[in-house]
């Protein structure tokens, strides 16, 4: 017939299954004069032939794996062999059959994995090839682990991505693999074609030997670095190594320093980039991180400790330009006048900061020189020769040489002779009550004001008050500054408060004079006061990296397929546990450690896409604070819904007897996605026996006409089966039934005697 198997010369495409012996011609081209013959050129492979009269055929079975498309050209020639039409392209598409089995590229694979490697991160790929068409099930491969040897406690340590062949550790494998216990494993892996879904799929197996290696991602020993180094920088100080090459290293400064003098190169070598100053900062703690090429951490960060070693690069410094001490008139020989505390910024308790004190001059030398002595190492001034008289000499000036092992400094001390100290400081309140503060209250904050008074000579060491915390603050988190004019004490935070180590502190203050009390007078309860400091915990919830996470998968993914993942971090650095909320369809599960989301049930786009669930990130430990983010799973359509009738067609009737052949129109639909052009259904009768009575013809992609072929129908109901094909990939077919009644009519409607069956047809044709 013209059209399907014969016709004029024009570009055409034909699809032929491979492996089939030729059974019919491909096409008969018709010549228009003056054309008398046809010529075939292109990728004929001596298989495709055109006869002189235009008969195109093939002479042996095709093989898609040799050539999947034959690009041919056909030209019409006149009697002289001159092209008068064409050449036109003729494309032969060779359709695939499952005539090739999958084969692994290797019969044995070898790989290694580090203990504690991240679960789900591939460390080895097995790879099989199947010469069949990967766009069809024939070439779609499905990988599986058949057996793991040894299998300890029936726990799988390894898993395989059934589509990619990527082998990785399970969560149990990440936690439990230990080369000291079991250094090697063997897996038997199978691969099947037909997506693993068919009984007649071909398969192959391979063996995988896996060596478990030690994890060398370990924190190095603490480093000591001498300050003020004059060597050229940067200087390598230590190193970290990821287990495999190619890691991207970085350093994280948890302290957020304005100047961070360290760097790391892509070998994992850590450098100090400039000379350090111990007096600026004597120790550094930071973290080394290893990431993969996508910026994803390969493991936990390593803590790096750097201690800065001291050199004697600081001279002693005087506490002030002039240090003022007071001595009471009647003090006895040997009494302490005060201690000159010079400072040295070099490291405490080392020779670099060990100071010597020596008096080099006293003025006036009245009534004699050498009235004072200073303890060589302690710096304590003492009355050396006799008691002093205020009316004779009310003030002495001393020059004191303070030295460390390399430097000398002169300090100046003024000693005032004052009245006797016979009054003690008295607190205006003995109990300052409770004070509640958050643990993140700023250092330097004044949290309390205290006040004591002293009746001795004003503005002398006898009336000046020093406040000390004598109990309840062994860590030295608090301090008290005194206003010298009012003797008011301001309690300030010197070190960060810590809920974990000191939630409640019972603080006791003592008020004392710098000058000793006269003999017989003692400090009593009036010079003491207390208060209670309550510290509250501060905690921040984990933070998700995105407000909404989105992933896209085909609705037909295998159960257990990873469909997405979420990430959150805890500001306090606590581990995070992930969970799902609102998984109303029970389609998903989340790995509570990694945040990877897997399917646990068949997905269905037609039930609704995107599928929205909430993901919850909860701190592990601490106050278990949690945050919520959205996960949207976009489901891509596959052709998994057969066509059906668009509405209920019960009640179709023809008036009996038919005066002429009649017809009715019906509509089909399906639930799959039809982008742009809408469905393209084809319609045919559901069984051969119907063809004598009925005919079905397509009107458009969704509508068809059912027509009677004659008028000789009985007065009864006929059930006409219609086959509707959606032409999808794979094509799905629905067989629907149209009940058509032939009945006697009254005024164009079916007549039924009273009491007859229910469900009277209501639509006449």
């Amino acid at each position: 017939q013209e059209g399907k198997f014969s016709g004029p010369l024009k570009p055409m495409t034909f699809s032929i299954y491979e492996g089939q012996e030729p059974s019919q011609i491909i096409f008969q081209f018709k010549a228009n004069p003056p054309a008398v013959t046809f010529e075939l050129t292109g990728e004929t492979d001596n298989i495709f032939v055109i006869e002189r009269e235009g008969l195109l055929y093939y002479n042996r079975a095709l093989d898609r794996e040799t050539r999947s498309t034959h690009n041919l050209q056909v030209a019409a020639l006149d009697a002289n062999g001159i092209i008068v039409e064409g050449p036109v392209p003729i494309t032969i598409k060779v359709k695939d059959i499952n005539d090739n089995r999958p084969t692994f590229l290797q019969s044995k694979y070898e790989g290694s994995v580090r203990q504690n490697s991240r679960p789900g991160k591939p460390f080895l790929y097995v790879n099989a090839t199947d010469l069949d068409d990967p766009a069809t099930p024939n070439g779609q491969l499905y990988y599986q682990i058949v057996i793991q040897l040894p299998m300890i406690n029936n726990v799988m340590y390894f898993q395989i991505n059934n589509k990619t062949g990527a082998i990785s550790l399970t969560r149990e494998g990440s936690q439990e693999l230990n080369p000291a216990k079991n250094p090697s494993y063997n897996l038997v892996i199978s691969v099947k074609d037909m997506g693993g879904q068919s009984e007649n799929s071909f398969s192959d197996t391979t063996s995988v030997d896996i060596i478990v290696t030690e994890n060398i991602w370990k924190a190095p020993k603490p480093v000591e670095m001498v300050e003020n180094s004059t060597d050229p920088h940067p200087i390598k100080i230590t190193q970290v190594r990821w287990n495999d090459p190619g890691a991207q290293y970085s350093l994280v400064d948890k302290e957020k320093l304005p100047r961070f003098p360290f760097s790391i190169d892509q070998e994992g070598d850590i450098y100090v980039t400039q000379p350090l100053d111990r007096e600026e900062k004597d120790a550094y703690v930071f973290y080394a991180v290893a990431k993969d090429e996508y910026g994803k951490p390969l493991s936990y960060p390593l803590e790096i400790h750097v201690k800065v070693k001291d050199i004697n690069d600081n001279p002693p410094t005087c506490p002030s330009p002039v240090t003022v001490f007071e001595v009471q008139e009647n003090e006895r020989l040997g009494n302490s006048i005060g201690t000159l505390t010079a400072h040295d910024r070099d490291e405490e308790n080392t020779a670099n900061s060990f100071l010597n004190y020596r008096i080099v001059e006293q003025t006036p030398k009245l009534p004699m020189d050498g009235l004072f002595l200073i303890q060589t190492y302690a710096g304590m001034l003492q009355l050396a020769k006799q008691s002093l008289k205020k009316q004779d000499t009310p003030q002495y000036n001393l020059t004191i040489e303070v030295s460390d092992k390399d430097f000398k400094t002169l300090c100046f001390v003024q000693i005032n002779v004052i009245d006797i100290n016979d009054q003690i400081p008295i607190f205006e309140k003995s109990d300052y009550g409770n004070l509640t503060l958050a643990e993140d209250t700023n250092i330097g904050s004044t949290i309390l004001t205290i006040q004591a008074t002293d009746a001795d000579e004003p503005f002398t060491g006898s009336s000046k008050i020093l406040y000390h915390i004598i109990k309840g603050d062994s860590e030295g988190r608090l301090g008290v500054d005194t206003d010298p004019h009012t003797n008011t004490g301001y309690v300030i935070i010197k070190k960060p408060l810590d809920f974990e180590t000191a939630a409640v502190s019972n603080i006791v203050f003592k008020a004392e004079n710098p000058e000793p009390l006269v003999f017989g007078v003692k400090y009593n309860a009036s010079s003491f006061a207390k208060f209670t400091l309550i510290v509250t915990d501060v905690n921040e919830a984990p933070q998700f990296s995105q407000h909404v996470f989105q992933a896209k998968v085909s609705e037909d993914v295998a159960i257990g397929t990873k469909v997405g993942n979420v990430t959150a971090k805890d500001p306090e650095g606590l581990d995070i546990s992930y969970s799902l909320r609102g998984d109303t369809r029970g389609w998903l599960k989340i790995d509570h450690v990694t945040g990877e989301i897997f399917s646990v049930a068949p997905l269905d786009r037609e039930a609704g896409s995107p599928y929205r669930v909430q993901v919850v990130a909860t701190e592990v430990g601490g106050s278990s604070l949690s945050s919520v983010s959205e996960f949207h799973l976009i489901l891509m359509d596959v052709n998994d819904n057969p066509p059906r009738l668009a509405k209920d067609y019960t009640g179709l009737f023809f008036c009996h007897p038919l005066s002429a052949p009649g017809s009715l129109i019906f509509e089909a639909t399906d639930d799959d996605q039809h982008l742009f052009r809408g469905p393209h259904f084809t319609f045919s009768l559901g069984s051969g026996s119907l063809q004598n009575d009925w005919e079905v013809s397509k009107i458009n992609g969704t509508h068809a006409r059912l027509s009677t072929r004659h008028t000789e129908f009985e007065e009864r109901e006929y059930v006409v089966l219609i086959r509707i094909n959606d032409g999808g990939r794979p094509p799905l077919e629905g067989i629907v039934s149209l009940p058509v009644t032939f009945c006697s009519c009254v005024e164009g409607s079916c007549f039924r005697p009273a009491g007859h069956q229910t469900g009277i047809p209501t639509v006449g044709m």
């Epitope: 008398v36 050129t41 002189r52 050209q73 009697a79 002289n80 092209i83």
Partner: antibody, heavy 123, light 113 residues
Framework: QVQLQQSDAELVKPGASVKISCKVS????????IHWMKQRPEQGLEWIGY????????QYNEKFKGKATLTADKSSSTAYMQLNSLTSEDSAVYLC????????????????WGQGTTLTVSS | DIVMSQSPSSLAVSVGEKVTMSCKSS????????????LAWYQQKPGQSPKVLIY???TRESGVPDRFTGSGSGTDFTLTITSVKSEDLAVYYC?????????FGGGTRLEIK
């Protein structure tokens, strides 16, 4: 061997007609086209047209339409060219030639020629 | 119609000399589908019918001496005789078979000095 034997020289009066023959041998007559050329002394060759005996397809040079008529007799393997309304301008040597191409061959040229027929038109 | 122009119309050479003659067409003879030039060269000796030398512009017919060479493409073609012999005295025609009506050039007459 292939031969194309043309009819003998003709002397005809102006206004008359003449039919020149070209009898072939040594190959299947219907496989190849037969072409006719006109050659006047000291002038080049002019292509008149061809006939394909198998399907009796003809094609003419527009210049010779109405002047020449090409026919073939398969039974005698002979091609004919009739020239009518003759004038002195038609005086020339007329050559038949076989075009080398046939289905499956690649000979795109005139491979065999007749010996020529001299036509003289004179009163 | 495609007009074929040959030059020179005649030339005289001594035996052993090289000779080239030109043939130009009024439109391209190169067919896009097969990249062939639809041109042939013929030799017509005195008192004889023409005989093919070259077809497809450069393919030498079997039995033709290799001193005859055809070249060119599109609209410009050349016939070269590398070492003329006395038996090469003839008129040489080019002919196009790209489109009907087929046409011949006016010919180049080769004379021997």
């Amino acid at each position: 061997q292939v031969q194309l034997q043309q009819s003998d020289a003709e002397l005809v009066k102006p206004g008359a007609s003449v039919k020149i023959s070209c009898k072939v041998s040594g190959y299947t007559f219907t496989d190849h086209t037969i072409h006719w050329m006109k050659q006047r002394p000291e002038q080049g060759l002019e292509w008149i047209g061809y006939i394909y005996p198998r399907d009796v397809i003809t094609q003419y040079n527009e210049k010779f339409k109405g002047k020449a008529t090409l026919t073939a007799d398969k039974s005698s393997s002979t091609a004919y060219m009739q020239l009518n309304s003759l004038t002195s301008e038609d005086s020339a040597v007329y050559l038949c030639a076989r075009w080398g191409y046939f289905y499956g061959s690649r000979s795109y040229y005139f491979d065999y020629w007749g010996q020529g027929t001299t036509l003289t038109v004179s009163s | 119609d495609i007009v074929m122009s040959q030059s020179p119309s005649s030339l005289a050479v001594s035996v052993g000399e090289k000779v080239t003659m030109s043939c130009k067409s009024s439109q391209s003879l190169l067919h896009s589908s097969n990249q062939k030039n639809y041109l042939a060269w013929y030799q017509q000796k005195p008192g004889q019918s023409p005989k093919v030398l070259i077809y497809w512009a450069s393919t030498r017919e079997s039995g033709v001496p290799d001193r005859f060479t055809g070249s060119g493409s599109g609209t410009d073609f050349t016939l070269t005789i590398t070492s003329v012999k006395s038996e090469d005295l003839a008129v040489y025609y080019c002919q196009q078979y790209y489109s009907y009506p087929w046409t011949f050039g006016g010919g180049t007459r080769l004379e021997i000095k």
